[in-house]
Interface confidence: low
């Protein structure tokens, strides 16, 4: 399937709107400092070419790669230097070292402005004057942000963000219509390109084979009606996809991605009986939607493991003729029949099942060998059974914000070497996990929380990998993709760290917390609990309690204060000392 | 698109060794899974070795592991295959093949391209 002209291509593929988008992110993606018009400006003379491309296919230049393409336009920047820095010297190198220098350059946690959003009439005013620039805008910012984000789906939100305008513009109450709807989609924004990020870290980090070791086992559990060739297919398909779209060749992933969702729809009969209501629907919601369908009932007579992969004498013939498949096939077989379980568990049952074949299949007699392998899955299952029950009562019986500092200080006490705001940021997302997943039925809870941990602390390790300072976290993040959690989860107090000196600074506050959302307040407040750990990591739970509880009276009585920055002056130096004494 | 040329075949007496290359023109390797596979007379082509893009990642066919080493040196587009200790069951025409999207590394159907194959020799 060779094409002339790539460029050509896939903008007849993909069409000039959707084109336009793609290219726009995929800028924005890579030079994350460049200014709106700069890229708008790089992204209309792409659209130009490819448009004399798609009249003469001939054309001079209309035969190079896209990465030679895009690649040649960013590097006309003329500010490619002062911004970047040493990005600039990727322009130096050949394709395909230009684009890995170009990746390797991504920055996860960009030194930009948070996005403040106007006030409602302002933007219903942008969006009907200019609704094309407004769409543009919203990609930009997202995409320079999230330089991960998956493309084909922020194509999708932005569908979204543009329907929400257009309906609630109109509406008697813009901001009851509107509000509601950009923080759905903000919430969801930060998830996808959180999950996304794992997806990438997989692939990059792990490579292909530890992706599709896992996308075998979510299909599995989607699929379970699906045979074990039909979801090998599919999980080709899809690595390919996520390959393009992690290596930021955004059309092809785009257009490989509506492929697939063709596909799917096409062959709903082998693959599910939940796909119907997503393929009715327009391309961009399509391919969502099945992303996110739900599990397929499993088949009601599938026959116990044990006869195939233990009782069976050809269990090591089977595993030496092709071990990979037959260990993908020992995947697919046991997440069908376990949606209750997560992705990580069913991984890392895998790996303990191979570990027994390695070491049985060379022993004197195989089968007495393996014939308990089973049993030794217990303690595996057992392990994030019990980690979901344990803090999904003590997230019952704190709350969110509660619960969100007990992690804190669990996480700080572990890596206290960690920045101060990514402890926060990780924390405050690990203790999400309650109110996301502790409402769900015991058949749910496993899965939910585990994977979304391990999405999480993907998190962790992507911020700690640009400016590493712990081994720990180092350990962690790159032994093992499957046991990252359970690795974290077994840290203990750092014994070795040097507490970290004490300063009043960081404890001295001032009347600007008061005008501060509820949000902002329990984040300054859970940064001052933080460094409280670093300066006190042997400090009780009841100490650090006594302490906080201090912190926010004292912030309360002030705020109600009429001379508010005079209370806090005069207040402020009060609490540190008490709280020094307190923790002494 | 990758053409790709093999070489390094003969013939050679048990136990001895030989090194074949997998020369790749058109494109670079980089982006692609590399793998060995072979067919002896009267068999089906199966499985040898393969290696992942960056090289962090070998596999191998139980028959052969301990004695084939795969490698690849992505600058000369270039992938090899050193074979010790080679025995008369060894003896089958060699093919390299590339594969954009493997998944499981040890089957034919997940690479698309093939070489025309280079053949060894193992008799006393």
């Known amino acids: 399937d060779t094409h002339k002209s790539e460029v050509a291509h896939r903008f007849k593929d993909l069409g000039e709107e959707h084109f336009k988008g793609l290219v726009l992110v995929a800028f924005s993606q890579y030079l994350q400092q460049c200014p709106f018009e700069e890229h708008v400006k790089l992204v209309n003379e792409v659209t130009e070419f490819a448009k004399t491309c798609v009249a003469d296919e001939s054309a001079e230049n209309c035969d190079k790669s896209l990465h030679t393409l895009f690649g040649d336009k960013l590097c006309t920047v003329a500010t490619l230097r002062e911004t970047y820095g040493e990005m600039a010297d990727c322009c130096a190198k050949q394709e395909p070292e230009r684009n890995e220098c170009f990746l390797q350059h991504k920055d996860d946690n960009p030194n930009l402005p948070p996005l403040v959003r106007p006030e409602v009439d302002v933007m219903c005013t942008a969006f009907h004057d200019n609704e094309a620039t407004f769409l543009k805008k919203y990609l930009y910012e997202v995409a320079r942000r999230h330089p991960y984000f998956y493309a084909p789906e922020l194509l999708f939100f932005a569908a979204r963000y543009k329907a929400a305008f257009a309906e609630c513009c109109q509406a008697a109450d813009k901001a009851a219509c509107l509000l509601p709807k950009l923080d759905e989609l903000r919430d969801e924004g930060k998830a996808s390109s959180a999950k996304q990020r794992l997806k990438c870290a997989s692939l990059q980090k792990f490579g292909d084979r530890a992706f599709k070791a896992w996308a075998v086992a979510r299909l599995s559990q989607k699929f379970p009606k699906a045979e074990f060739a039909e979801v090998s297919k599919l999980v080709t398909d899809l690595t390919k996809v996520h390959t393009e779209c992690c290596h930021g060749d955004l059309l092809e992933c785009a257009d490989d991605r509506a492929d697939l969702a063709k596909y799917m729809c096409e062959n709903q009969d082998s693959i599910s009986s939940k796909l119907k209501e997503c393929c009715d629907k327009p391309l961009l919601e399509k391919s969502h939607c099945l992303a996110e369908v739900e599990n397929d009932e499993m088949p009601a007579d599938l026959p116990s493991l044990a006869a195939d992969y233990v009782e069976s004498k050809d269990v090591c013939k089977n595993y030496a003729e092709a071990k990979d498949v037959f260990l993908g096939m020992f995947l697919y077989e046991y997440a069908r029949r376990h949606p209750d379980y997560s992705v990580m568990l069913l991984l890392r049952l895998a790996k303990a099942y191979e570990a027994t074949l390695e070491k049985c299949c060379a022993a004197a007699d195989p089968h007495e060998c393996y014939a308990k392998v089973f049993d030794e899955f217990q303690p595996l299952v057992e392990e994030p059974q019990n980690l979901v029950k344990q803090n999904c009562e003590l997230f019952e019986q704190l709350g969110e914000y509660k619960f969100q500092n007990a992690l804190l200080v669990r996480y700080t006490k572990k890596v206290p070497q960690v920045s101060t705001p990514t402890l926060v940021e990780v924390s405050r997302n690990l203790g999400k996990v309650g109110a996301k997943c502790c409402k769900l039925p015991e058949a749910k809870r496993m899965p939910c929380a585990e994977d979304y941990l391990s999405v999480v602390l993907n998190r962790l390790c992507v911020l700690h990998e640009k400016t590493p300072v712990s081994e720990k976290v180092t350990k962690c993040c790159t032994e093992s993709l499957v046991n990252r959690r359970p690795c974290f989860s077994a840290l203990e107090l750092d014994e070795a760290y040097v507490p970290k000196a004490f300063n009043a600074e960081t404890f001295t506050f001032h009347a600007d917390m008061c005008t501060l959302s509820e949000k902002e307040k329990q984040v300054k407040k859970q940064t001052a609990l933080v460094e409280l750990v670093k300066h006190k990591p042997k400090a009780t739970k009841e100490q650090l309690k006594g302490v906080m509880d201090n912190f926010a009276a004292f912030v309360e009585k002030c705020c109600k204060a009429d001379d508010k920055e005079a209370c806090f002056a005069e207040e402020g130096p009060k609490f540190v000392a008490a709280s020094q004494a307190a923790l002494a | 698109e990758v053409q790709l040329v093999e070489s390094g075949g003969g013939v050679v007496q048990p136990g001895g060794s030989l090194r074949l290359s997998c020369a790749a023109s058109?494109?670079?390797?980089?982006?692609?899974?590399m793998g060995w596979f072979r067919r002896a007379p009267g068999k089906e082509r199966e499985f040898v070795a393969a290696?992942?893009?960056?090289?962090?990642?070998?596999y191998y066919a139980d028959s052969v592991k301990g004695r084939f080493t795969i490698s690849r040196d992505n600058s000369k587009k270039t992938a090899y295959l050193q074979m010790n200790s080679l025995r008369p069951e060894d003896t089958a025409l060699y093919y390299c093949?590339?594969?954009?999207?493997?998944?499981?590394?040890?089957?034919?159907?997940?690479?698309?391209?093939w070489g025309q194959g280079t053949l060894v020799t193992v008799s006393s």
């Open positions: 093949a590339a594969g954009r999207y493997s998944a499981w590394y040890s089957q034919s159907y997940e690479y698309d391209y």
């Open positions: 058109g494109s670079t390797i980089s982006s692609y899974v």
């Open positions: 290696i992942s893009r960056s090289g962090g990642y070998t």
